[in-house]
Interface confidence: medium
């Protein structure tokens, strides 16, 4: 997260760290007791590594009573996700067992009504991604509030040049932005999950390259079919 600040500890009980061989790889969001939603591109290079999900964490390294690392039983990428596009960049991870819920571990309601979030709406994005252009990784969860950007502006030739489909949304990126390592994490508007940080190699913090988020409402049928 660029231009953000340390989050209040355990105030986002839905927040997940998707880990590869014991190290943070991507963000994720607990959407059901046994399911975490993230970005499909996150695991493309996971190769033969061990993928796990950390729940109930604020610090990645310090012991915390609510922290627990879960093995992944099943990884389900969206059937249309492809390595070379940002479209359909969603992944559902089934935990090896139902998460132990509590004040610091709780699923987040996700948007089912397929309607765009109003431009200008302030939404919260959180993650353990890099906090500066030198690539410094934080140990504790960071967050930032970002205004939603209208699709027409986001699709300008100077911005994302028509790449933003109706299944994607944008948020402003003027010095405050999601960045590498935040992919798969939640964009939360009014206490509801609206978007998932896409995992392309976009430049961060440049106002002409807004943050791109996959709209979960557009994928409600797929999410329901996997969770069923």
């Amino acid at each position: 997260i660029l231009g953000g600040r340390e989050a209040e500890a355990h105030a986002r009980p839905y927040m997940a760290s998707v880990q590869l061989n014991g190290a943070h790889l991507c963000g994720g969001v607990l959407v059901a007791e046994q399911w975490v939603l993230s970005a499909a591109h996150c695991l493309e290079d996971a190769a033969d590594g061990k993928v796990q999900v950390l729940l109930g964490a604020h610090s990645l390294s310090q012991p915390e009573p609510s922290k627990r690392l879960y093995d992944v039983l099943r990884a389900v990428p969206h059937p249309d996700s492809q390595p070379d596009t940002i479209d359909h960049d969603l992944l559902l991870l089934q935990l090896s067992e139902k998460a132990t819920l509590g004040p610091a571990v709780r699923p987040l309601p996700w948007q089912r009504v397929d309607r765009d979030v109003a431009p200008g709406t302030l939404c919260d994005v959180a993650g353990w991604g890099i906090v500066n252009h030198a690539g410094r990784r934080p140990d504790s969860l960071q967050h930032v509030l970002l205004p939603v950007l209208d699709r027409a502006t986001c699709n300008r030739r100077t911005h994302h040049d028509g790449a933003i489909t109706e299944r994607l949304m944008c948020a402003e990126s003027n010095r405050r932005d999601s960045c590498k390592g935040d992919s798969g994490g939640p964009l939360v508007c009014g206490g509801v999950l609206e978007g998932v940080v896409t995992s392309g190699s976009r430049v961060c913090g440049n106002r002409k390259k807004p943050g791109i988020y996959t709209r979960v409402a557009s994928y409600a049928a797929w999410i329901d079919s996997v969770l069923a």
Epitope: D45, K50, R74
Partner: antibody, heavy 120, light 112 residues
């Protein structure tokens, strides 16, 4: 550019031995499981062997037809995959492909193959 | 071992036609983790095979959307909605759910 280049094929007599090599480049070889897949002349594809990464203890798996005769192993420091083939039979005659094993999918990158001919 | 049976062995088509290839496994290829590791590969003449479809219906990178996979349990299908000249070659199904992994015998797609 992600690349796999096989070598070591050739003509060998029945009951003989041969070691195939595969040089990998353009990706983090040590994190990937790797496979050998073969194809007899004019025939279909046959999976031969798989080796996992260090984080999975270099676990190996084999097709029944080559078990106890073939050994798959790797050298991560050199980004090399090997197949040691002993007690070769005429039915081992084939093109041998070195293949990378992805996370969501199995065989995403293939080499161009090396030909093994077992004949007296 | 899981036997993968492909039909037909040869499929003559006209360019622009739809083509359909069937693959049947001798037992369920649902992995213990719930995934179905059923894939389709195309081997063009003189080339190494290329991955087309993974996990039954996911198209791999760069694969045109005229290719689609379907099925579950033991019965699977690859469909090509409008065959183009570059689609000619041998198609193989593959199961990666149970060791030893096995390929189907192949289906040769050729021009009528």
């Amino acid at each position: 550019e992600v690349q796999l280049v096989e070598s070591g094929g050739g003509l060998v007599q029945p009951k003989g031995s041969l070691k195939l090599s595969c040089a990998a480049s353009g990706f983090s070889f040590n994190t990937y499981a790797m496979n050998w897949v073969r194809q007899a002349p004019g025939k279909g594809l046959e999976w031969v062997a798989r080796i996992r990464s260090k984080s999975n203890n270099y676990a190996t798996y084999y097709a029944d037809s080559v078990k106890d005769r073939f050994t798959i192993f790797r050298d991560d420091s050199e980004s090399m995959l090997y197949l040691q083939m002993n007690n070769l039979k005429t039915e081992d005659t084939a093109m041998y492909y070195c293949v990378r094993h992805g996370y969501y999918w199995y065989f995403d990158v293939w080499g161009t193959g090396t030909t093994v001919t077992v004949s007296s | 071992d899981v036997l993968m049976t492909q039909n037909p062995l040869s499929l003559p088509v006209s360019l622009g036609d739809q083509a359909s290839i069937s693959c049947r496994s001798s037992q369920s290829i649902v992995h213990s983790n719930g995934n179905t590791y059923l894939e389709w590969y195309l081997q063009k003449p003189g080339q190494s095979p290329n991955l087309l479809i993974y996990n039954v219906f996911n198209r791999f990178s760069g694969v045109p959307d005229r290719f689609s996979g379907s099925g579950s349990g033991t019965d699977f299908t690859l469909k090509i909605s409008r065959v183009e000249a570059e689609d000619l070659g041998v198609y193989y199904c593959f199961q990666g759910s149970h060791v030893p992994y096995t390929f189907g015998s192949g289906t040769k797609l050729e021009i009528k």
